[in-house]
């Protein structure tokens, strides 16, 4: 708390202007008056204030709005939003996109605070869904943001939102994630033709089940390893050698470099040999010929 | 339209000193901090250092601290340098700029040291 | 002294991207997000072409471009012009010092 002292003769501001740079704590929190510089914030970004300094307007702005601050100052904070904690910004209510904009603007470079976290939450909560252009925000100032949000909170993001997604928006996305954005993706473009379906939905595969892989591998798609790899192993599992092959085209050769690894390892242990070796890749580890498959889940399913 | 209008060219003996003014038009004079900046031939860019009108006291960079006094006259909005005990080495143009981000700049000064 | 550090020149061709770097310390870049960029013709004062890290003001093409990370700043000009051609210089307000510090300065070459 900065002691309460007198403005010195002639210090008292008029207005928010450069000569404030060379003043001490106490003549700011003296002689600057709050409703003053809430009117003219968008003058602060422009002087280089001390972090301390702007700890003092900061204390003045809190003692104007002690119940959070108009949109109108919030978006011209600048650089006293790195000043604000969690709680202040839970106190905020912000509805303008170009407001969000400003302040992710200010953090731009660095990871995801508490207070941006917190900044995003109050923001979609208050629009209600995660829509498109809100979407294409976040992600343009931090790729991950997508694969931040829990398979519940990415349930509220609707179809349309999908076509801002860029396949490095989903790099850090986990299967469960994946499965809630996938159906979304496939609703999203189900109007596109068969290659252009393939180069938007590929990077959201991770979630797509085995009826859909088949129906792929009718379209000659060419699927890429990388892409194969990150395929859900229970999707993968059912395919046949044939679907497979028709799956990665050219790419199948590169089954063998990977056939140590999931999903390609366990799906090799579900192949007959001799249908593998129809490859020419030198793949091991299939059924022997002659051994009979039992599939187990479904004659539990029967008993 | 802000301008920033200096004195002209300036030839001085070594141990002398020069007086470079620096008149503002087209915007508040007072409340900006207006600064001096250095060019040698060839080199970069050297704060010397600023002020801000309406308090009259001025700042240094350290190397200038002793040898340069910035002064301001509020009632003809004019800023001004004065650098003293002048060397060879101090041959350069001169600058005034507004604000601290330096938003406009005077024409520059050319201010040659030579015996 | 040149506080901020900076390449002695860069050059790029007619349409092409470059970036500029200039790394300064905690107490001038990195601390605070008081960066600007200036442009120098030869014969002529320097223009700002960039404040606050990565504001433009109005008039400045906005095929330049300021960011920062850590504690250096970037200037990037995209869409390169003969006209680009020029000595690029970063300053950044010193709180230490209650002062502005430089860069040595960049000359741009546009093949």
């Known amino acids: 708390e900065v002691e309460k002292t007198a403005c010195p003769s002639g210090k008292k501001a008029r207005e928010i202007d450069e000569s404030l740079i060379f003043y001490k704590k106490w003549e700011l929190e003296a002689c600057v008056d709050a409703a003053l510089l809430a009117t003219q914030m968008d003058r602060v970004n422009a002087i280089p204030f001390t972090y301390e300094q702007l700890d003092v307007l900061k204390h003045k702005l809190d003692e104007l709005y002690p119940q959070g601050y108009p949109e109108s100052v919030i978006q011209h904070l600048g650089y006293l939003f790195l000043k604000m904690s969690p709680e202040d910004i839970r106190k905020w209510n912000v509805t303008s996109l170009e407001t969000l904009k400003a302040l992710l603007e200010v953090n731009k470079g660095h990871e995801m605070s508490p207070q941006v976290a917190t900044l995003i939450d109050r923001f979609v909560k208050g629009r209600g869904q995660l829509d498109k252009d809100t979407l294409d925000t976040l992600t343009a100032f931090y790729p991950g943001y997508l694969c931040s949000l829990s398979p519940e909170e990415l349930s509220s993001v609707p179809p349309s939102s999908i076509w801002a997604v860029r396949p490095q928006d989903l790099d850090t996305c986990d299967p469960r994630q994946l499965d809630v954005l996938y159906p979304k993706a496939r609703l999203a473009f189900q109007n596109m033709n068969g290659s252009e379906y393939f180069v938007k939905i590929q990077s959201f595969l991770g979630g797509a089940p085995t009826e859909d892989l088949k129906a792929l591998s009718q379209q000659n798609v060419s699927m890429d390893l990388a892409t194969f790899m990150k395929l859900r192993t229970d999707a993968v599992l059912p395919l046949t050698v044939a679907e497979v092959q028709k799956l990665l085209g050219p790419h199948v050769e590169g089954l063998k470099a990977e056939e140590r690894h999931r999903p390609v390892r366990d799906w090799i242990l579900r192949q007959r040999q001799d249908d593998l070796d129809t490859l020419g890749l030198g793949l091991q580890g299939g059924i022997p010929n002659g051994y009979l498959v039992l599939d187990l889940s479904m004659q539990e399913a029967l008993s | 339209q802000v301008q920033l209008v200096q004195s002209g060219a300036e030839v001085k003996k070594p141990g002398s000193s020069v007086k470079v003014s620096c008149k503002a038009s087209?915007?508040?004079?007072?409340?900006?901090?207006f600064s001096w900046v250095r060019q040698a031939p060839g080199q970069g860019l050297e704060w010397m250092g600023g002020?801000?009108?309406?308090?009259?006291?001025?700042n240094y960079a350290q190397k200038f601290q002793g040898r340069v006094t910035i002064t301001a006259d509020e009632s003809t909005s004019t800023a001004y340098m004065e650098l003293s005990s002048l060397r060879s080495e101090d041959t350069a143009v001169y600058y005034c700029?507004?604000?601290?981000?330096?938003?406009?700049w005077g024409q520059g000064t050319l201010v040659t040291v030579s015996s | 002294d040149i506080a901020l550090t900076q390449p002695a020149s860069v050059s790029g061709s007619p349409g092409q991207s470059i970036t500029i770097s200039c790394t300064g310390t905690?107490?001038?870049?990195?601390?605070?997000?008081?960066v600007s960029w200036y442009q120098q013709h030869p014969g002529k004062a320097p223009k700002l072409m960039i404040y606050?890290?990565?504001k433009r003001p109005s008039g400045v093409s906005n095929r330049f471009s300021g960011s920062k990370s850590g504690n250096t700043a970037s200037l990037t000009i995209s869409g390169l012009q003969a006209e680009d051609e020029a000595d690029y210089y970063c300053?950044?307000?010193?709180?230490?010092?209650?002062?502005?510090?430089f860069g040595g300065g960049t000359k741009l070459t546009v093949l």
């Open positions: 087209g915007g508040t004079f007072s409340s900006y901090y």
């Open positions: 905690s107490s001038d870049v990195g601390g605070y997000n008081y």
């Open positions: 700029a507004r604000r601290t981000s330096m938003d406009y």
């Open positions: 606050s890290v990565s």
């Open positions: 002020i801000i009108p309406k308090f009259g006291s001025a």
């Open positions: 300053g950044a307000w010193a709180h230490m010092s209650l002062g502005k510090v």
